[in-house]
């Protein structure tokens, strides 16, 4: 927890971030929190990055005032407004990029005092894996596929019934680029698999960890996918 | 290549309401924001309002507030404008237009157009 | 809401001259953080749709001729055409996104 120090004579207000991870592409939130104040009139909330010379978002007198945001921000980002006054500054971030990576500041300024933390934001690509089995092989064989990774991950597999187990051998994981350029396609094939065995395909990198199971017996095929977040810390 | 298609001319009776279409291609319609752009015969270019596809999330101006209502069809890549209680002043050509991408906003100048659409509001 | 005014409404000049036409905004459109003014220019040639020339007031956008050259900040702009070509036959407005977007009455320039 960092608590930010009131300056000119103002008492300091506790201001919470967590770190945590967009999706390039998609929208990404970017959560701050702080002791309300009653009156939503005296409440400022400006979210900076560093390296970048605009504001992020500036929300004062109860709206938006964009008039100083950066460019690459433009059209972008939202707070939430109806929740302002319950002490939510989080920032809602349309169209998540690369380039938004980075350190961002919520700085909060109400009638009790001003306070700032710092929020460590990573940006990639992650999905779930789906885990089938590949009736066009000539062995029993399993296909993992994620449409969306950046960083490339690694893909390691596991089974039930043989854990410890080195896979490597008999897999093939091929990384194919996405039209986009950025993001990659993720497709690992498992060879020689056995009836009546649970298989997991684990993707990872950095950002996130995901994994996708698949418990195939004669009679049936059962499947499962979760995905973690690898960096949600608290400041 | 970035296309914006719209549909075809409009002849409408006054009170009445249309429903104008811009169809994209060429690029992820859902994070980019659409614009629309109203042009009188002879006259010069007015910014209506625009919409983002990925939320359905919307801008107006003061003045066609209530009177065009945007929304987005994300699975067809196509942006819609209904003008309501149609008067004569509202005879025009309407334009999509789409922002160029700077480091993933697309609030910013229209490096691209649709032909426009005529609409003629006439007893 | 934020005003743009353009002047002279209309002009006409020989090829190969140069011109300018001025924007004038109701109030600042400078981010003073960034530095940049949020004007831009746009040509509409007869029947056509418009095509931007010039965004953040001075830089050109790819493709658009080193003939057209924007500057200004703040409040007043101006686009220049270093020298007319006939197919510069257009009108041309100017745009304001410091607050959501507003365009200019434009300045329709004809070619003697």
């Known amino acids: 927890l960092i608590i930010g120090f009131g300056i000119s004579g103002r008492h300091s207000i506790t201001v919470t971030t967590v770190a945590s991870a967009g999706n390039i592409g998609e929208d990404g939130i970017l959560s701050c929190t702080f002791e309300p104040d009653i009156k939503l009139s005296d409440i400022v909330i400006q979210w900076l990055k560093e390296g970048v010379l605009g504001l992020v978002h500036e929300f004062k007198e109860g709206k938006d005032e964009l008039s100083e945001q950066d460019e690459m921000f433009r059209g972008r980002t939202a707070v939430f407004a109806d929740q302002v006054i319950v002490g939510n500054a989080s920032l809602r971030l349309k169209n998540v990029q690369l380039t938004d990576a980075g350190t961002y500041k919520c700085y909060i300024i109400t009638s009790k005092g001003k306070g700032n933390a710092n929020l460590e934001y990573k940006t990639g690509a992650f999905s779930m894996p789906e885990v089938n089995v590949d009736y066009n092989a000539s062995s029993e064989t399993l296909r993992c596929e994620a449409p969306r990774w950046f960083p490339q991950p690694t893909v390691v597999w596991a089974s039930q019934v043989d854990q410890g187990a080195n896979f490597s051998e008999v897999s093939n994981t091929s990384f194919e680029l996405n039209s986009e350029n950025v993001t990659m396609k993720v497709v690992s094939v498992l060879y020689n698999v056995t009836i009546n065995n649970t298989y997991s395909c684990m993707i990872e990198n950095d950002i996130a960890k995901a994994t996708g199971d698949i418990k195939v017996t004669e009679s049936e095929i059962k499947r499962r996918s979760h995905l973690q977040l690898l960096n949600s810390k608290a400041s | 290549q970035v296309q914006l298609q719209q549909s075809g001319a409009e002849l409408a009776r006054p009170g009445a309401s249309v429903k104008l279409s811009c169809k994209a291609s060429g690029y992820t319609f859902t994070t980019y924001w659409m614009q629309w752009v109203k042009q009188r015969p002879g006259q010069g270019l007015e910014w209506i309002g625009a919409i983002y596809p990925g939320d359905g999330d919307t801008r107006y101006t003061q003045k066609f507030k209530g009177k065009a209502t945007l929304t987005a069809d994300k699975s067809s890549s196509t942006a819609y404008m209904q003008l309501s209680s149609l008067a004569s002043e509202d005879s025009a050509v309407y334009y999509c237009?789409?922002?160029?991408?700077?480091?993933?906003?697309?609030?910013?100048?229209?490096?691209?157009w649709g032909q426009g659409t005529l609409v003629t509001v006439s007893a | 809401d934020i005003v743009m005014s353009q002047s002279p409404s209309s002009l006409a000049v020989s090829a190969g001259e140069k011109v300018t036409m001025s924007c004038k905004s109701s109030?600042?459109?400078?981010?003073?953080?960034?530095?940049?003014?949020?004007l831009a220019w746009y040509q509409q040639k007869p029947g056509q749709s418009p095509k931007v020339l010039i965004y953040?007031?001075?830089s050109r956008e790819s493709g658009v001729p080193d003939r057209f050259t924007g500057s200004g900040s703040g409040t007043d702009f101006t686009l220049t055409i270093s020298s007319v070509q006939p197919e510069d036959l257009a009108v041309y407005y100017c745009k304001q996104s410091y607050n959501l977007y507003t365009f200019g009455g434009g300045t329709k320039l004809e070619i003697k």
């Open positions: 237009a789409r922002g160029r991408d700077y480091s993933g906003s697309s609030w910013t100048w229209f490096a691209y």
């Open positions: 953040w007031a001075s």
């Open positions: 109030q600042s459109l400078l981010n003073s953080r960034t530095r940049k003014s949020y």
